[in-house]
């Protein structure tokens, strides 16, 4: 006869491990008992359980309520046991010793491997600002047994670097993603991908990139000269910029206060029916937490009664 077993039994933390030990013998042979032991390099052999053909299952007190026989129907030649709720400390070598009649004793050893799936965490780096050099965008850490694989999935151009720390029963892997921040990266996903044999599928954590920037400001609204004549209605100046965080807009007049009736609505300056009093230099001030920009325009309202005059447009930033 011979024992059918496995060299390695792999189980995920918290699951039940089946330690296989099946005696393949002649029809007239009987199994009297199967003794299970944990083989520890330091502590030697520690008894785990005994499956006895007459007495039944004995479980060592250290494994009380954790060792069972597989559910019926059971073959009398099957000495397999279930180790419930495997923990990391269960990892190691196990031995089954089968006493048969009349063939004698057989033994086999197997290794129990307990996979500890990682629970990854993603930590964003310091605030990203356009104009910075190579900067940490995010770091991702995952600890497990064996060591997990940590990579990045993104369309953003950058560099990744990994380091690992080995603990007695696990390994922690940290991967960092560095990039040169630009406004085109804003809102782009940066995904940490953790692979591990204890996971049915990769674990993914996505971080949305936020890059602080403020674009140059410009003013639109003076393109059509016919709008800027005395008596015309609906004339507006719009300040153009973009930024992250979204900027705030402020309008002022360089050569005095804003004329009465001129309304400020965020990035837009609205004029009442135009008079020559509305002529002047207007300044759009754009700002966010990162920076501020100015753009100024000179408005001259043309009086149709004075054909010699034309609208003069000067823009400066």
């Amino acid at each position: 006869g011979e024992l059918e077993t496995s060299d390695v039994v792999t189980v995920v933390l918290g699951q039940d491990a089946k330690l296989p030990c099946f005696y393949r013998g002649d029809p007239d042979e009987q199994v009297g008992q199967v003794a299970w032991a944990r083989v520890d390099p330091n502590e030697g052999i520690r008894e785990l359980a005994l499956l006895h053909s007459k007495y039944g299952l004995h479980v060592n007190p250290a494994y009380e309520d954790r060792v069972e026989q597989p559910p019926p129907p059971r073959d009398p030649l099957d000495g397999s046991v279930l180790l419930r709720n495997a923990v990391q400390a269960d990892e190691g070598e196990y031995e089954c010793r089968v006493s048969t009649f009349p063939a004698g004793s057989f033994q086999a050893r197997m290794r129990l491997r307990v996979l500890v799936p990682p629970l990854p965490s993603l930590n964003p780096g310091p605030p990203l600002e356009e104009g910075q050099g190579l900067t940490l965008a995010a770091s991702c850490t995952a600890e497990g047994s064996p060591a997990p694989s940590v990579t990045w999935d993104t369309e953003v151009k950058g560099t990744q670097s990994s380091r690992s720390f080995t603990h007695p029963r696990s390994a922690a892997v940290t991967s960092e993603f560095h990039l040169v921040p630009s406004r085109s990266m804003n809102g782009q996903p940066l995904t940490c991908v953790v692979s591990h044999p204890g996971l049915l599928q990769d674990r993914r954590i996505t971080h949305t990139l936020q890059v602080a920037f403020l674009a140059e400001a410009s003013v639109r609204g003076l393109e059509d000269q016919n709008l800027w004549q005395v008596g015309r209605e609906g004339a507006t100046l719009k300040c153009l910029s973009e930024g992250q965080p979204p900027p705030k807009y402020n309008w002022t007049r360089l050569d005095g206060p804003l004329p009465s009736g001129v309304r400020v609505k965020g990035d837009t300056l609205g004029f009442p029916p135009l008079t020559t009093e509305h002529s002047g230099v207007y300044v759009c001030h754009v700002s966010n937490e990162l920076s501020s920009r100015d753009s100024q325009v000179t408005v001259e309202v043309l009086d149709p009664e004075d054909p010699g005059k034309q609208v003069d447009l000067v823009s400066a930033s």
Partner: antibody, heavy 126, light 107 residues
Framework: EVQLVESGGGLVQPGGSLRLSCAAS????????MSWVRQAPGKGLEWVSA????????YYADSVKGRFTISRDNSKNTLYLQMNSLRAEDTAVYYC???????????????????WGQGTLVTVSS | DIQMTQSPSSLSASVGDRVTITCRAS??????LAWYQQKPGKAPKLLIY???SLQSGVPSRFSGSGSGTDFTLTISSLQPEDFATYYC?????????FGQGTKVEIK
């Protein structure tokens, strides 16, 4: 025929010592674990101690741990129980018994006692 | 330690009666249970091992059953030589422990 014969019992004062012997015959002595079981007058059975076939492993009831020592001489087919610091509550008939040999190489469990000696009376009294 | 509780502690019966003695363990012991018979002034004698296996030479009127925590010794038809004290014993753990005994007396 399996035979177990105890000897060495008698009257001893509290704090005294006594050594019990059990001569075995009719079986391969070294192949069997052996036990001592006692029975106080008019009382039930109490397991005292056990020893593996080789003598390498010994086991004791808490009530006698540190005072009693079990041993065996396989060349003489004899089991011993050295009893020190005896107390009145140790008064009992002491039986040696053979453990049934149908569990092999597994020390965590004892086995039934299939053969017993006739017993020897130990009386601890001043 | 595992506690073994026998009931009844004594019983009176007549020759030919069916007698049942029960034994309860304080925790599960699979079938690691033996039954012994002891007559006055004599050593105990193994009757049943592994809860239900009859020891060689023991009359078939003795039988045992149970597993886990509850066990029974049955004498199907009591004979004059069966009047004695009966003990159950667990050997699942060290120390092995005995029940307090059941004395079977003549009615």
């Amino acid at each position: 025929e399996v035979q177990l014969v105890e000897s060495g019992g008698g009257l001893v004062q509290p704090g005294g010592s006594l050594r019990l012997s059990c001569a075995a015959s009719g079986f391969t002595f070294s192949s069997y674990a052996m036990s001592w079981v006692r029975q106080a007058p008019g009382k039930g059975l109490e397991w005292v101690s056990a020893i593996s076939g080789s003598g390498g492993s010994t086991y004791y009831a808490d009530s006698v741990k540190g005072r009693f020592t079990i041993s065996r001489d396989n060349s003489k087919n004899t089991l011993y129980l050295q009893m020190n610091s005896l107390r009145a509550e140790d008064t009992a008939v002491y039986y040696c018994a053979r453990e049934y040999s149908d569990v092999v190489d597994y020390v965590s469990v004892r086995t039934p006692l299939d053969y017993w000696g006739q017993g020897t009376l130990v009386t601890v009294s001043s | 330690d595992i506690q073994m509780t026998q009931s009844p502690s004594s019983l009176s019966a007549s020759v030919g009666d069916r007698v049942t003695i029960t034994c309860r363990a304080s925790q599960g012991i699979s079938s690691y249970l033996a039954w012994y018979q002891q007559k006055p002034g004599k050593a105990p004698k193994l009757l049943i091992y592994a809860a239900s296996s009859l020891q060689s030479g023991v009359p078939s009127r003795f039988s045992g059953s149970g597993s886990g925590t509850d066990f029974t010794l049955t004498i199907s038809s009591l004979q004059p030589e069966d009047f004695a004290t009966y003990y159950c014993q667990q050997h699942y753990t060290t120390p092995p422990t005995f029940g307090q005994g059941t004395k079977v007396e003549i009615k």
